[in-house]
């Protein structure tokens, strides 16, 4: 009975552009102007999203697409099909409840958007910091203490162990 | 249909003062946090102040005592009051609503106004 009531349905057949008008008699009338209708058999076209303030207009809206939106420069897009516009910040800085903010000590962020991350703790991998941490940088991690113990160099490996009682070659 | 109608812009001297009205239809004016932006030729956007719904406000760094966001919920009308004006405050001027209450940010569901032109001149 769906089938056959679909295939009588004189809106199936109303292509992407136009809706069904039922004021009409049913016929397929063209979407209105900024108005736009995907798919077929649609009983009404869907307005058209406008990219106003921030907002501009990366594709325009046309009978059968809806309009697409980017951010003006100084903000980045959030959210799917960019549904909202968020300033950006500097490097060494995020966006918090009163503006822009520099990372507070031992945090950093090297984007102009996100959040202040904390400095990796090199000492959680036994290892060293071999370049301080910014605001904008995290810390380089180096060898761990004990590679750098007097004599041993980071660079070469340390020879191999021999087993006791053997004597050098 | 909403709408946002700003209204007050226009020349003045430097260290002189204006005030911008931004008149709300459409809508329920009084749950709703409000925003001034404002645009320099040439450059981005940049926000200048907020108002909650409640009457809290937030100011830019570099408006900050001196410049005033009020509003009048009987009226559906936000107001900037801009003293002390410096060539660097001249701008076209956006009344906003303020949906995400994230300052430096709007969703795509907020409304704008067209904009006033504030000028300053020497």
């Known amino acids: 009975f769906e089938r056959t009531r679909s295939l009588q349905d004189p809106c199936s057949n109303c292509p992407a552009g136009t809706f069904c008008d039922n004021n009409r008699n049913q016929i397929c009338s063209p979407c209105p102007p900024n108005s736009f209708s995907s798919a077929g058999g649609q009983r009404t076209c869907d307005i058209c999203r406008q990219c106003k303030g921030v907002f501009r207009t990366r594709k325009e809206c046309s009978s059968t697409s809806n309009a697409e939106c980017d951010c003006t420069p100084g903000f980045h897009c959030l959210g799917a099909g960019c549904s909202m516009c968020e300033q950006d910040c500097k490097q060494g800085q995020e966006l918090t409840k009163k503006g822009c903010k520099d990372c507070c000590f031992g945090t950093f962020n090297d984007q102009k958007r996100g959040i202040c991350r904390p400095w990796t703790n090199c000492s959680l991998d036994g290892k060293s910091v071999l370049v301080n941490g910014t605001k904008e940088r995290d810390v380089v991690c180096g060898p761990s203490p004990a590679d750098l113990s007097p004599g041993a160099s980071s660079v070469t490996p340390p020879a191999p162990a021999r087993e006791p009682g053997h004597s050098p070659q | 249909a909403v709408q946002l109608v700003e209204s007050g812009g226009g020349l003045v001297q430097r260290g002189g003062s204006l005030k911008l009205s931004c008149v709300g239809s459409?809508?329920?004016?009084?749950?709703?946090?409000m925003s001034w932006a404002r645009q320099v030729p040439g450059k981005g956007f940049e926000w200048v102040a907020y108002i909650y719904s409640d009457g809290s406000t937030y100011y830019a760094d570099s408006v900050k005592g001196r410049f005033t966001i009020s509003r009048d919920n009987a009226k559906d009308t936000v107001y900037l009051h801009m003293n002390s004006l410096k060539f660097e405050d001249m701008a076209v001027y956006y009344c906003?609503?303020?949906?995400?209450?994230?300052?430096?940010?709007?969703?795509?569901?907020?409304?704008w106004g067209q904009g006033t032109q504030v000028t300053v001149s020497s």
């Open positions: 459409g809508f329920d004016f009084s749950d709703h946090a």
């Open positions: 906003a609503t303020w949906r995400s209450q994230q300052v430096g940010r709007w969703d795509e569901y907020d409304h």
